[in-house]
């Protein structure tokens, strides 16, 4: 791939290894700054899948407050608003990053970690099984 | 609430305002351990809201990969395989913690910063606007 | 002194509109998710809308969705919420409030409360 | 949607007495429940959160517990300012939901 020369201007580091230890400016820069707020704040009630949002909190963790997602039904709402078993509701997860403060209750000291949250659900057809 | 006392073993830091510059451990610990990746890796094809995922890359990010969803069709699949324009595919958005590389291309020192990612797609019933 | 101070209330007249504003002082805003609440004359605490931190996504009690409108202003420390095609039964005392901030939980769920600002549905 | 119900409505009891209020969920909410107090004309007050933790400067003759989804909040050493309507607030799932309300009286 494409070699990126370092900037002089980086801080010093003595230790190149990986797993290694960085600055992070925690002062969050936020990408989504046309987001409408609307867009999807109510899919989870008018999807076929529908899901309720549940309370995770951490206090030792950035993000400290996560809101996950749990399908309401195992089946799908049909167009008369009713369950249907014939398909399935299923959680969207993804893989996200948060800080987790390492060693504990320290404010300056942190660690990556990796954890899978729920979205939101999503319709699927179900995988069927045929007995020969 | 609860004051839980600083950790004796802390790093020092002089800084003790917000933002403030910290020392982040990049060796990740992965907190899904149990979890079946085959699990969901086909609701994209199999969802009624199906999506494709497209590759977003930024070698001065960390996660430099991110797979985006992108809702295949406006409607949704109905029962006989059909797109049904009555029903909505509508990406379910998460926003997600990354490391952006500050001053850029330095390999120790990075900022915080919040993206919004599409993870998939599900199906809505539309929103409709009465004229009067 | 850490506080949230309502405004923006005042008479409307049935199927009319009225825009409440939420100023934050004493801390950071934007790590905190917030929430409006209301309470009818003599009646109890009815919740109403919650906004994310950002602002990137909210949702609504049933008795207001498609009317309100929450959103928020980090630059500015400022929560809003937009009430549209107002009703006899919106008639109440709108409280804002922060829940836990996501720095991690520097503080304690829906600590701070502010004094209310008062929305009268009248013809 | 989850049902929190406050019991008592209404509570008579004395300078000195202590007294325990009562919030039942229709559904688990793990121990996302908070307690507020609210007197005649003024806004909420925060007493407790995550079901049994003290908020700040509230004195500790306030205290909550849990039993699956029972939540109750104890007040000891009843003093006149105690005297004031208490709400619970669940807030593990949207949409948020207060208790009714449990109006405390001097007898």
């Known amino acids: 791939g494409i070699t990126i020369p370092r900037n002089p201007g980086c801080p010093n580091s003595e230790d190149k290894n990986f797993p290694r230890t960085v600055m992070v400016n925690l002062n969050i820069h936020n990408r989504n700054t046309n987001t409408n707020p609307k867009r999807s704040s109510d899919y989870y009630n008018r999807s076929t899948s529908p899901w309720n949002l549940h309370r995770n909190e951490d206090p030792e963790r950035y993000p400290s407050v996560i809101w996950e997602a749990k399908c309401r039904h195992l089946g799908c709402i049909n167009a008369d608003g009713n369950v249907d078993y014939h398909m399935n509701s299923v959680p969207i997860q993804q893989e996200i990053l948060v800080l987790r403060r390492e060693p504990p209750h320290c404010p300056n000291s942190f660690r990556l970690e990796k954890i899978l949250v729920s979205v939101g659900c999503t319709c699927v057809t179900p995988i069927v099984h045929h007995v020969a | 609430g609860i004051t839980i006392p600083r950790n004796p073993g802390c790093p020092n830091s002089e800084d003790k305002n917000f933002p403030r510059t910290v020392m982040v451990n990049l060796n990740i610990h992965n907190r899904n351990t149990n979890t079946n990746p085959k699990r969901s890796s086909d609701y994209y094809n199999r969802s009624t809201s199906p999506w494709n995922l497209h590759r977003n890359e930024d070698p001065e990010r960390y996660p430099s990969v991110i797979w985006e969803a992108k809702c295949r069709h406006l409607g949704c699949i109905n029962a006989d395989g059909n797109v049904d324009y009555h029903m909505n595919s509508v990406p379910i958005q998460q926003e997600i913690l990354v490391l952006r590389r500050e001053p850029p291309h330095c390999p120790n020192s990075f900022r915080l910063e919040k993206i919004l990612v599409s993870v998939g797609c599900t199906c809505v019933t539309p929103i409709v606007h009465h004229v009067a | 002194e850490v506080q949230l101070l309502e405004s923006g209330g005042g008479l409307v007249q049935p199927g009319g509109s009225l825009r409440l504003s939420c100023a934050a002082s004493g801390f950071t805003f934007s790590p905190y998710s917030m929430m409006w609440v209301r309470q009818a004359p003599g009646k109890g605490l009815e919740w109403v809308s919650y906004?994310?931190?950002?602002?990137?996504?909210?949702t609504y009690a049933d008795s207001v969705k498609g009317r309100f409108t929450i959103s928020r202003d980090n630059s500015k420390n400022t929560l809003y919420l937009q009430m549209n095609s107002l009703r006899a039964e919106d008639t109440a005392m709108y409280y804002c409030a922060r829940d836990t901030s996501l720095w991690f939980g520097d503080n304690d769920a829906f600590d701070i409360w502010g004094q209310g600002t008062m929305v009268t549905v009248s013809s | 949607e989850i049902v929190m119900t406050q019991s008592p409505s209404s509570l008579s009891a004395s300078v000195g007495d202590t007294v325990t209020i009562t919030c039942r969920a229709s559904h688990d909410i793990n121990t996302y429940l908070a307690w507020f107090q609210q007197k005649p004309g003024k806004a909420p007050k925060s007493l407790i959160y995550a079901a049994s933790n003290l908020q700040s400067g509230v004195p500790s003759k306030f205290s909550g517990s849990r039993s699956g989804t029972d939540f109750t909040l104890t007040i000891s050493s009843l003093q006149p300012e105690d005297f004031a309507t208490y709400y619970c607030?669940?807030?593990?799932?949207?949409?948020?939901?207060f208790g009714g309300g449990t109006k405390l009286e001097i007898k």
């Open positions: 607030l669940q807030y593990d799932t949207f949409p948020l939901t």
């Open positions: 906004i994310y931190s950002s602002g990137g996504w909210t």
